[in-house]
């Protein structure tokens, strides 16, 4: 039996885009590629694999806003930005099966509901392949 | 012979926490998980594998301090922050077998020795599995 | 037949250094190690594998400059810094086969052509092994 050098199984990763955020709600995320190894459900990114994740968040907003990125109810946010017009942040966090990554947004004006987002992008990349996963 | 798709060997990574730093010394690091693939020894994180590492450092300090994160005697620091009360930094560095990652802290007051740390966390994640390792 | 636990094939990664940048051109990059899994050609880093890349850019410049890091003609830059004397940035970007990572530099003075760089370093690390590569 000839041994083929092992290939890497696909790494859990996803890039979602968002062009609009809603006050008191979140940002409407869409995955532009069908080849992503992670999924979007109910406007959240579903975590199937335990481990560290590299998280990149970018965007320019049409209004000043406060934005948080959450992963679990009752836990503090992965990112929290207050009264900003843009974000360009990178972080590392330990996430686990059943976590869901989602936005919360608050604007400081009552004259508009939706915020336009330029270059809105959220990337998650699993850093611990080989660890526990459940699908 | 049935071929099972290859699994990833565990990636070298660790998350340590620190709640206290000592003036003229460092921060007291503990690893909350027993499943870490890297080890703490003499208040340092031991590097067994050559390669790039993703490094995340976070914390809020009870006093203003200057903080450096070193990996090898005679080499410049991985991070160096002067007169700060918090840190939230990410970096990439090439580390090698026999390196040790440790803190050095200086406060600018003689009235206290220990600094309390809220949310003190240091994460290292190896980025080049497949490279040289020695255990 | 005895099964040997699979090893990781080498991850695509590179660290290049630059000590000089030219106005209206770019920065002269050199790879200090012969063991790099990625190559430099015509002052650009060649991308062979599709996927996310972790990108680290550092340097102190002898003159104020505007610096951009590009990967594809007609696309926006990976990094863009205006009128700076130093850079210490980390980003994540999706790059693909045939992309080339290169600098563009502009100074705001007509009295010199070359900018000296202290600690100039650019690191790229592929985050999606197992994806498409062409050599």
């Amino acid at each position: 039996l000839q041994q083929v050098p092992p290939q890497y199984p696909p790494i859990q990763s996803i890039r979602v885009q968002f062009t609009r955020c809603e006050n008191e709600k979140g940002c409407i995320i869409t995955s532009p590629s069908k080849d992503e190894t992670m999924k979007v459900q109910d406007n959240s990114i579903i975590i199937n694999c335990d481990g560290f994740y590299l998280i990149s968040l970018k965007g320019y907003f049409s209004e000043e806003l406060s934005l948080s990125l959450y992963y679990r109810k009752g836990r503090g946010p992965l990112f929290s930005l207050s009264k900003v017009t843009s974000v360009d942040s990178i972080g590392v966090a330990y996430l686990a099966f059943k976590d869901k990554v989602y936005f919360n947004v608050t604007t400081h004006s009552t004259s508009y509901k939706d915020i336009q987002v330029n270059g809105g992008e959220l990337i998650l990349i699993h850093q611990n392949p080989g660890g526990f996963c459940a699908y | 012979l049935q071929q099972v798709p290859p699994q990833y060997p565990p990636i070298q990574s660790i998350r340590v926490q620190f709640t206290r730093c000592e003036n003229e010394k460092g921060c007291i690091i503990t690893s909350p998980s027993k499943d870490e693939t890297m080890k703490v020894q003499d208040n340092s994180i031991i590097i067994n594998c050559d390669g790039f590492y993703l490094i995340s450092l976070k914390g809020y300090f009870s006093e203003e301090l200057s903080l450096s994160l070193y990996y090898r005697k005679g080499r410049g620091p991985l991070f160096s922050l002067s007169k700060v009360t918090s840190v939230d930094s990410i970096g990439v560095a090439y580390l090698a077998f026999k390196d040790k990652v440790y803190f050095n802290v200086t406060t600018h007051s003689t009235s206290y020795k220990d600094i309390q740390v809220n949310g003190g966390e240091l994460i290292l994640i190896h980025q080049n599995p497949g490279g040289f390792c020695a255990y | 037949l005895q099964q040997v636990p699979p090893q990781y094939p080498p991850i695509q990664s590179i660290r290049v250094q630059f000590t000089r940048c030219e106005n209206e051109k770019g920065c002269i990059i050199t790879s200090p190690s012969k063991d790099e899994t990625m190559k430099v050609q015509d002052n650009s880093i060649i991308i062979n594998c599709d996927g996310f890349y972790l990108i680290s850019l550092k340097g102190y410049f002898s003159e104020e400059l505007s610096l951009s890091l590009y990967y594809r003609k007609g696309r926006g830059p990976l990094f863009s810094l205006s009128k700076v004397t130093s850079v210490d940035s980390i980003g994540v970007a999706y790059l693909a086969f045939k992309d080339k990572v290169y600098f563009n530099v502009t100074t705001h003075s007509t009295s010199y052509k070359d900018i000296q760089v202290n600690g100039g370093e650019l690191i790229l690390i592929h985050q999606n092994p197992g994806g498409f590569c062409a050599y």
Partner: antibody, heavy 122, light 107 residues
Framework: EVQLVESGGDLMKPGGSLRLSCVAS????????MSWVRQAPGKGLQWVAY????????SYADAVKGRFTISRDNAKNTLYLQMNSLRAEDTAIYYC???????????????WGQGTLVTVSS | SYVLTQLPSKNVTLKQAAHITCGGD??????VHWYQQKLGQAPVLIIY???SRPTGIPERFSGANSGNTATLTISGALAEDEADYYC??????????FGEGTQLTVL
Amino acid sequence: EVQLVESGGDLMKPGGSLRLSCVASGFTFSSFPMSWVRQAPGKGLQWVAYIHSGGSSTSYADAVKGRFTISRDNAKNTLYLQMNSLRAEDTAIYYCARTFPTVAADNWFYYWGQGTLVTVSS
Amino acid sequence: SYVLTQLPSKNVTLKQAAHITCGGDNIGSKSVHWYQQKLGQAPVLIIYYDSSRPTGIPERFSGANSGNTATLTISGALAEDEADYYCQVWDSSAKWVFGEGTQLTVL
């Protein structure tokens, strides 16, 4: 409510100079980049000039480079366009508009003022 | 620099669909934004990022973009939609580039 109010438009002779103003209200002016866009009578829209939120970075359309200067006074919530060496082809309605930083990978204008008319004629 | 081509005028029957096109070399690889300008008024953004609608813009306005053509569609044109429509793209060298505009008449 976001408001952008332009003023300063006038009838000018070729070679003359004029300064347009745009007073902003209803938002944190110092947080947002701004632009000037013009529209010649019966013609289409043309971007003229851009300034970053802090005022440190500017850019211009080739047609006005070296003649027009964009600036801002964040303390007064006011955007300016200094127009020198005016030509007949500069005749247009000048709009100030709110936009995104030019380092963004894309860009558009999402708030516009009502415009001020500049006429250049001998 | 980058050029956007629009038809100068377009007629549409009341409550019928209107399709306004914007041509450009490989425009599908860029994002297209659309503005409506009624007579004597300032332009108003009606579509950004090819197909996103700002708050307050009616659902009858939609956008699409592929190949060498971007299209603004008004699913059932009303009299109040009579206006000039401009497409715009962002070009790293020329910055904001506008089409010449299409004058829509609702019959």
